[in-house]
Interface confidence: medium
Amino acid sequence: SERCDDWGLDTMRQIQVFEDEPARIKCPLFEHFLKFNYSTAHSAGLTLIWYWTRQDRDLEEPINFRLPENRISKEKDVLWFRPTLLNDTGNYTCMLRNTTYCSKVAFPLEVVQKDSCFNSPMKLPVHKLYIEYGIQRITCPNVDGYFPSSVKPTITWYMGCYKIQNFNNVIPEGMNLSFLIALISNNGNYTCVVTYPENGRTFHLTRTLTVKVVGSPKNAVPPVIHSPNDHVVYEKEPGEELLIPCTVYFSFLMDSRNEVWWTIDGKKPDDITIDVTINESISHSRTEDETRTQILSIKKVTSEDLKRSYVCHARSAKGEVAKAAKVKQKVPAPRYTVELACGFGAT
């Protein structure tokens, strides 16, 4: 067979669809691999061919487009299931070719089962809402292209297992779900079930997403360094271990990169010769505010190390802060026996 540009198995597009529901899957070639779209390819005389490999099989098979009621069909660059069956799970390949050109990509399709409370192995998208931030909305995702605009579907929203009706602060508004004032108690999984008619049949689309209530930008502050602080002095003798924790609180900020780092005499620990180790631990509040601790450790500190400047730095999208640790050498207690002996010496 002639050479074909094989993009392999595109595991980045692990497609999951519910059993017994319609699914429309676009050939990833035009979305992620090729510089032209399906219309251009079609105009140039290229043909799109679909085939698949069943789960736990190696054999590539053609897709049966002659099933009753056109259960599986192809329209332009979209493969349609009306509806899916559990044994449709497998790796699907779309190949674009003519006599001189060939390009193909495979992708995994998993048909998953859900229970009556919409629990399933489906990976759920997460939608973040700001706490106590006024009206915010989520929209029923991935339903475009399933029915024409002339069709008016019915949409039912659920929180977990419960139909959303007469909820205090959550109001279904068609494809949107409005949160009048988002609270931590609104965290959870929300499901929209879209029901629409097509050719005398009724289809359901189930879409679940996770709502996560996070800190509001109204309450966001620059990083706060809790430690080191002015009240704690790290007093050590040469040879002892020096441990200085830098503990920083970061308000939640969407897409902000929180950074904590130490400098020793103005340099990063990697850029100096002393034997320093840095260990980090992170915890999050339920609104995804973050507390980050970086512990600077010098196993056997020298008197030179005790004269250095140790500064903890922190940065987020809200700003940058720094705080120096108070480090000093412990003054040895006076050895009274020797001093007294000297004091009473003969003159």
């Epitope: 430690s227 924790p245 503990t247 915890s283 999050h284 509040s285 339920r286 601790t293």
Partner: antibody
């Protein structure tokens, strides 16, 4: 808020179930812990139930204490075969401070406690 | 299980003074340590988490420090309302499933003169 109930005077050997009822947040989101305090003594950790339903117990509490989630707003603590040593105020507390592994690291919302007295 | 040893058992300090409470873990807990204040007839109240982070609404007179096995709670400029029993609490075995647990120190009674 967090509220404990079910504490009462019982005789040794009796089983008892305490209930913790929460409002304003969901137990499908938060972990909850049980802590007890004998009269005039310190705090003693019993165990935690995670938001996913996993339970963790203090080694001394394993076997005789069972924590279970009965709804998204209630958690039970079942104690089998009470002894006089179990006389204490039992606190239910929301556990927070989540790390990467979803393990709670402190208790930041406590109930007022419910008193269990075991006496013959 | 980790054992938390809290010292002293009791401390008395005049108004305006400084109180220092120490807590020692039987093995390293990095910074997974919290401090609580408990007044008679009331549940404990979280003061400090992650060794040095101040809980929401808590006065900055409460300072937590330490790492590994040695931790300190310092109350500077002690006020009469600070009279209470203070407990440290550690978390250990994070990420290790069945060995995950919590332990409290024995408590320190603070008397304000």
């Amino acid at each position: 808020s967090v509220e404990e109930s079910g504490g009462r005077l019982v005789t040794p050997g009796t089983p008892l179930t305490l209930t913790c009822t929460v409002s304003g947040f969901s137990l499908n989101v938060y972990n909850m812990g049980w802590v007890r305090q004998a009269p005039g003594k310190g705090l003693e950790y019993i165990g935690i139930i995670s938001s996913s339903g996993t339970t963790y117990y203090a080694s001394w509490a394993k076997g005789r204490f069972t924590i279970s989630k009965t709804s998204s707003t209630t958690v039970d603590l079942k104690i089998t075969s009470l002894t006089t040593e179990d006389t204490a105020t039992y606190f239910c507390a929301r556990a927070d401070g989540y790390t990467e592994g979803d393990y709670a690291t402190y208790f930041n919302l406590w109930g007022q406690g419910t008193l269990v007295t075991v006496s013959s | 299980d980790i054992v938390m040893t809290q010292t002293p058992a009791s401390v008395s300090e005049p108004v305006g003074g400084t109180v220092t409470i120490k807590c020692q873990a039987s093995q390293s807990i990095t910074t997974w340590l919290a401090w609580y204040q408990q007044k008679p007839g009331q549940p404990p109240k979280l003061l400090i988490y992650q060794a040095s982070a101040l809980a929401s609404g808590v006065s900055s007179r409460f300072i937590g420090s330490g790492y590994g096995t040695e931790f300190t709670l310092t109350i500077s400029g002690v006020q009469s309302e600070d009279a209470a029993t203070y407990y440290c609490q550690c978390t250990y075995g994070i990420g290790s499933g069945s060995s995950y647990g919590v332990a409290f120190g024995g408590g320190t009674e603070v008397v304000v003169k």
